[in-house]
Amino acid sequence: DNKGYCAQYRGEVCNAVLAKDALVFLNTSYADPEEAQELLVHTAWNELKVVSPVCRPAAEALLCNHIFQECSPGVVPTPIPICREYCLAVKELFCAKEWLVMEEKTHRGLYRSEMHLLSVPECSKLPSMHWDPTACARL
């Protein structure tokens, strides 16, 4: 289980993407969750500079909402995953070509660390909004 806490996003990279005042999940498996997750996004965003103008905004939104998941506050703070349909829209519609390239690089082990893998969600493992409309976060 993820252990962490809910807090308002105070970073810069995802400022324009994440909903204002929304709570995000900060994962305490990192020594400094805010800094680590921000670095994760920052690293991935740098690679997005080369993608198409159609793909980029969709990929940025997916990235930010995946690394800084919406957080449901409670006694046990709970990260809410992105809906599968939004992930698939980015993968198969807006960023089809780029996604193939990225997956190819991943299979060939061209990424230096697991950072990039962490930043890309596996769409098939995400909950569908058709199962339960409240079971996932919409972009």
């Epitope: 252990k3 809910c6 909903a19 204002k20 005042d21 929304a22 709570l23 449901s72 506050p73 409670g74 006694v75 046990v76 709970t78 809410i80 339960d132 409240t134 079971a135 996932c136």
Partner: antibody
Amino acid sequence: EVQLVESGGGLVKPGGSLRLSCAASGFTFSSYSMNWVRQAPGKGLEWVSSISSSSSYIYYTDSVKGRFTISRDNAKNSLYLQMNSLSAEDTAVYYCARDRYDRSGYYYVPFDQWGQGTLVTVSS
Amino acid sequence: DIQMTQSPSTLSASVGDRVTITCRASQSITSWLAWYQQKPGKAPKLLIYKASSLESGVPSRFSGSGSGTEFTLTISSLQPDDFATYYCQQYNSFSWTFGQGTKVEIK
């Protein structure tokens, strides 16, 4: 049927201690976070403390930090509140309350079941 | 701590009236707000969570709305059983806090 029954309340002198208990039945106690909420006579509600199902997460309101300790025994389906250094401001009905997540499993639903409360009176 | 302010403190109404209670938060709590009903000598009862989600078993005449800092609880047609005190509660961040309560009494 979900039941929460508080006990352990009573009259105590300022500076004294008291241990409240809450006996739970009708649900899988070990799967739920639990809470204490109090209400001073004629006043509003005040959240006191919360504990997660496995006791990994524990929270207190500022006014009781260092004086109150929340704990649970899942084997006995029981929630506890150890109250030390009590003052007149702690006089209240203390409610044990359960919470849950909605059917999606993600969205928190606070205080969906309550006990009948136990009265704690701090007076010399 | 986030302060919750309810208005009015007391509300006089008749059976069949549409009643609205307002709850304001001192800072944004997005939708993390609950409403409770309490009758004298009884424990509170959860009515609404996540600002607008109706708790199971609660009559549909109760509804919640709002987001950010301003929220409302509406009783579409007041019934004799609805005369009670109502509390809002934020659970956006610890410490969780309640409003001071709104007493709905018979006019």
